[in-house]
């Protein structure tokens, strides 16, 4: 059987929230994105596809002030084929920071989620094909963007879940409903940023599969802030 993933504070993750440098990042991000394209062909191709898709759905989508085409394109690209490689790169950032070719993409996606967040909290479900284990101690976070659904049925579908996997039941306050942006609107997708921290974690196996409840969500300070802004601040905080 596959080795279970540990549910922890994802210490290697790139978790930048761009506090106090959004204006600056908006000026710098397009050039960073071009640099990413030069090093990451998949990102370039997925972005080009997403630009076309975004233009098609843009006028039938509601979005807040300050939300622009590159935020929309990033969301559409994420719901396409980028998520797996992108999330792996985000989660393992500290292991090879020089090979992170999603600098601007991370910014635009993070900013999109921040702009779409309406401060409301919701109960969502996330199914995984891999088993997650919780040590029983301390707070946890995903450390990557995590797709979830408003409906349990979707999370338990074979697209996302297997009996050897885990069903997360999450109370999220930072996650945003991206149904309107998604290539698969019927999934009722809620996108949760990796920096949302859960202080109450309960694991059980009552239904014949592994279930983990994540509650008491909070937005905590990140290890990285404005890292690609030229005025990078990195902190190492003990989140436990």
């Amino acid at each position: 059987l596959a080795v279970p993933f540990m549910l922890d504070m994802a210490p290697n993750a790139f978790d930048d929230q761009y506090e106090s440098c959004v204006e600056d990042m908006e000026k710098k991000a397009p050039q960073l994105l071009q640099e990413d394209f030069n090093m990451n062909e998949e990102l370039k191709l997925e972005w080009e596809k997403a630009e076309i898709n975004w233009k098609e759905i843009k006028n039938s989508t509601s979005y807040p002030a300050g939300f622009h085409d590159f935020h929309g394109t990033a969301l559409v690209a994420y719901t396409g084929n980028l998520a797996i490689d992108f999330n792996r790169a985000v989660r393992d950032f500290k292991k090879s920071p020089d090979n992170f070719h999603y600098k601007a993409f991370h910014y635009y996606l993070t900013r999109a989620v921040q702009l779409l967040n309406d401060q409301g909290c919701s109960l969502v479900y996330r199914g995984t094909k891999v088993m997650f284990e919780y040590t029983g101690k301390g707070s946890v976070r995903f450390g990557q963007f995590s797709s979830s659904s408003l409906t349990k049925r979707v999370a338990l579908s074979s697209n996302f879940f297997s009996n050897h996997g885990t069903l997360f039941i999450i109370r999220t306050c930072l996650g945003v409903n991206i149904k309107e942006f998604s290539s698969f609107p019927r999934e009722e997708e809620v996108l949760i940023p990796g920096y949302e921290v859960y202080h109450k974690v309960t694991a059980q196996n009552d239904n014949g599969y592994n279930e983990i409840f994540l509650d008491s969500p909070e937005r905590k300070k990140s290890n990285f802030n404005c890292f690609y802004n030229g005025s990078a601040q990195t902190v190492n905080i003990d989140f436990s």
Epitope: E26, A29, P30, D69
Partner: nanobody, 122 residues
Framework: QVQLQQSGGGLVQAGGSLTLSCRVS????????LAWYRQAPGKERELVAS???????NYNVAVEGRFIISRDNYKDTVYLKMNNVKPEDTAVYLC????????????????WGQGTQVTVSS
Amino acid sequence: QVQLQQSGGGLVQAGGSLTLSCRVSGTHFPIRPLAWYRQAPGKERELVASISAGHVTNYNVAVEGRFIISRDNYKDTVYLKMNNVKPEDTAVYLCNLGPATMSTDFRPTDFWGQGTQVTVSS
């Protein structure tokens, strides 16, 4: 609403230099490609140079190595530095704002600057 305000231009001697500026307002500037076009009397409007949102530049072969297009996202301005100008560079120069994209192939929109006359004397 979107506006493009040009400045610079004028009379310059052959071999001399000149810088044109185009300040954009009413849009999120950093994600918009920009270009300079020119139109000489009795000739068709032609693309001189373009710069993508990601700062990738493209030039008309007639100006390559002499002209430099650049952008300043903090000033919402695009520039055209014209070096070693020739009499055949004489024209009205216009800046154009492209649609939001990372594409390096410039596609013009209906957003134009008011035009700037550049006259090169021999």
